[in-house]
């Protein structure tokens, strides 16, 4: 029968950042397709992605729903033009993902230097606060809303003219730093939440230097 | 479990090199950053420098500043501090350690140290 | 570079005391400040974080408190093992500097 052709997906992995989550898995369809279903440790399964001959599921709409929860899902392989036809066990072919936590697990998305200004000696750095696809109360809200105060920025800063970084820290999106007079000085964010034990850290913001349009400079 | 092991230390000769290594185990250096301090015998802890693994940014004190240069394997999850043109004032206990990379909590794990003596 | 002044620099003192060490930033760090304490031979090991917040594993006899650019490690029955020199640490802004050291010594 056509099911002796079906094959289990396989490398079920979950691509996450800023909450926008694909479940990606292999084989590329050969005459069959897919179907994706997720759940909660606790919950009853939700089916997505129905008889599709992708290799990738967007699963942001569930699991947006509540960050915290740990999700499950599973991918069912069905001959193509026979989705009603099951395997040997009486059901068709799965394969389960490996457990997803959105709020320890998403990748944190490359952050963005809103804004910086210098007031004699002191910079004044803003970094841009990117809206998440998790709402509440039908608004999106972003990625300091989802994660308060967990949620760090760590900002590298150096004259244009050397190389050493040097560091500061908020629990906000605003930095005031010391400058010395006269210097130009480049910028670059990166977002970190120190609580987890990994994909603690995004990767690096562009740089933006002063005497550049994003900055302002007043002489007090 | 956490560890830090620094090894490559040694006696040389002033105006030689030496290039001590910091071996982490039970966590992956490239979520966290990596400080090397130092302390000379009988006397306090200096800091170094650092380095963030995940981007290969540095900060050097100024008595080493130009001479030392700090560098991060991450596929061997180790950290390195390569120490050229050494004076007899870099003699000392190398310790590397490890950023915890909150606002609160800084170094909160520290190698055993490994003792590098510039002599003639 | 802000400067860390910790006084005294050695202090005798007799198991049961209440040992009080002090630090001075030379300029505004916040909290950023920590206290480690280092044997002999050893590595320094953390004992307050954040000015006076109790690292994991550490007796409850240590605490830290702030007030403006001073900071204070209070040890309030010093223990046998707890003989041993003290350093705070401002990581407040690059570079993070250390205070000269408390030597605690057994009267």
């Known amino acids: 029968s056509g099911t002796t052709n079906t094959v289990a997906a396989y490398n079920l992995t979950w691509k996450s950042t800023n909450f926008k989550t694909i479940l990606e898995w292999e084989p590329k369809p050969v005459n069959q397709v897919y179907t994706v279903q997720i759940s909660t440790k606790s919950g009853d399964w939700k089916s997505k992605c129905f008889y599709t001959t992708d290799t990738e599921c967007d699963l942001t709409d569930e699991i947006v729903k509540d960050v915290k929860q740990t999700y499950l899902a599973r991918v069912f392989s069905y001959p193509a033009g026979n989705v009603e036809s099951t395997g040997s066990a009486g059901e068709p072919l799965y394969e389960n993902s490996p457990e997803f936590t959105p709020y320890l697990e998403t990748n944190l998305g490359q952050p963005t230097i809103q804004s910086f200004e210098q007031v004699g000696t002191k910079v004044n750095v803003t970094v841009e606060d990117e809206r998440t696809l998790v709402r509440r109360n039908n608004t999106f809200l972003s990625l300091r809303d989802v994660f308060g105060k967990d949620l760090i920025y760590t900002l590298y800063y150096w004259k244009s003219s050397s190389s050493g970084k040097k560091t500061a820290k908020t629990n906000t999106n605003e930095f005031l730093i010391d400058v010395d007079k006269g210097e130009n000085y480049c910028f670059s964010v990166q977002a970190v939440i120190p609580s987890r034990t990994v994909n603690r850290k995004s990767t690096d913001s562009p740089v933006e230097c002063m005497g550049q349009e994003k900055g302002e400079f007043r002489e007090i | 479990e956490v560890q830090l092991v620094e090894s490559g230390g040694g006696l040389v000769q002033p105006g030689g090199s030496l290039r001590l290594s910091c071996a982490a185990s039970g966590f992956t250096i490239s979520d966290y950053w990596i400080h090397w301090v130092r302390q000379a015998p009988g006397k306090g802890l200096e800091w170094v420098g650092y380095?963030?693994?995940?981007?290969?940014?540095?900060y050097y004190a100024d008595s080493v500043k130009g001479r030392f240069t700090i560098s991060a394997d991450t596929s061997k999850n180790t950290a390195y501090l390569q120490m050229n043109s050494l004076r007899a004032e870099d003699t000392a206990v190398y310790y590397c350690?490890?950023?915890?990379?909150?606002?609160?909590?800084?170094?909160?794990?520290w190698g055993q140290g490994t003792l590098v003596t510039v002599s003639s | 570079d802000i400067q860390m002044t910790q006084s005294p620099s050695s202090l005798s003192a007799s198991v049961g005391d209440r040992v009080t060490i002090t630090c001075r930033a030379s300029q505004d760090v916040n909290t950023a400040v920590a206290w480690y304490q280092q044997k002999p031979g050893k590595a320094p090991k953390l004992l307050i974080y954040?000015?006076?917040f109790l690292y994991s594993g550490v007796p409850s006899r240590f605490s830290g408190s702030r007030s403006g650019t001073d900071f204070t490690l209070t040890i309030s029955s010093l223990q046998p093992e707890d003989f041993a020199t003290y350093y705070c640490?401002?990581?407040?802004?690059?570079?993070?500097?250390f205070g000269q050291g408390t030597k605690v010594e057994i009267k």
């Open positions: 954040s000015a006076s």
């Open positions: 640490q401002q990581h407040y802004t690059t570079p993070p500097t």
């Open positions: 350690a490890r950023d915890y990379g909150s606002l609160q909590v800084f170094i909160d794990y």
């Open positions: 380095i963030d693994p995940y981007n290969g940014f540095t």
